[in-house]
């Protein structure tokens, strides 16, 4: 059987990013996203 390992040789850093909702619409409050490897994914 083939064995698959996730071992890319480098660390993928993640960081929480916070945006204000009113910058992108009419809502108030904060939008919290997660940036992984330079891409905002959530």
């Amino acid at each position: 059987d083939a064995e698959f390992r996730h071992d890319s040789g480098y660390e993928v850093h993640h960081q929480k990013l916070v945006f204000f909702a009113e910058d992108v619409g009419s809502n108030k409050g904060a939008i919290i996203g997660l940036m992984v490897g330079g891409v905002v994914i959530a």
Epitope: Q15, K16, L17, V18, F19, F20, A21, E22, D23, V24, K28, G29, A30, G33
Partner: nanobody
């Protein structure tokens, strides 16, 4: 770009309060989300709080939530940080910053204008 000048720092006992002010010059003040960061001796600059362009929305670091309140007065081009229940670990230089709309408000790289900072020392 706006120019920023902080004031209101000083020496306060644990459990005490201080109100920091940040005066902004420039006609584009309400195009910017405004934030406070702090830098303790030997440490990096960390996010404290931010307020949206309108003043309606705010966001706080977990370490200050419930103790600090950020606000702004667009008619006076000013931002404020009311700090209550101060602790020794709040000792730092506090910086006011301006971040253009749509950028992440909790990270230093979003801020393109900074004041010179005001020192807050919490000690008995």
């Amino acid at each position: 770009e706006v120019q920023l000048l902080e004031s209101g720092g000083g020496l306060v006992q644990p459990g005490g309060s201080l109100r920091l002010s940040c005066a902004a010059s420039g006609r584009t003040f309400n195009n910017y989300n405004m934030g406070w960061f702090r830098q303790a001796p030997g440490k990096g600059r960390e996010f404290v709080a931010a307020v949206s362009r309108s003043g309606v929305s705010t966001y706080y670091a977990d370490s200050v939530k419930g103790r600090f309140t950020i606000s702004r007065d667009n008619s006076k081009n000013a931002v404020y940080l009311q700090m209550n229940s101060l602790r020794p670990e709040d000792t730092a230089i506090y910086y006011c910053g301006a971040a253009y709309r749509g950028t992440a408000i909790n990270v230093r790289r979003s801020y393109d204008s900074w004041g010179q900072g005001t020192l807050v020392t919490v000690s008995s």
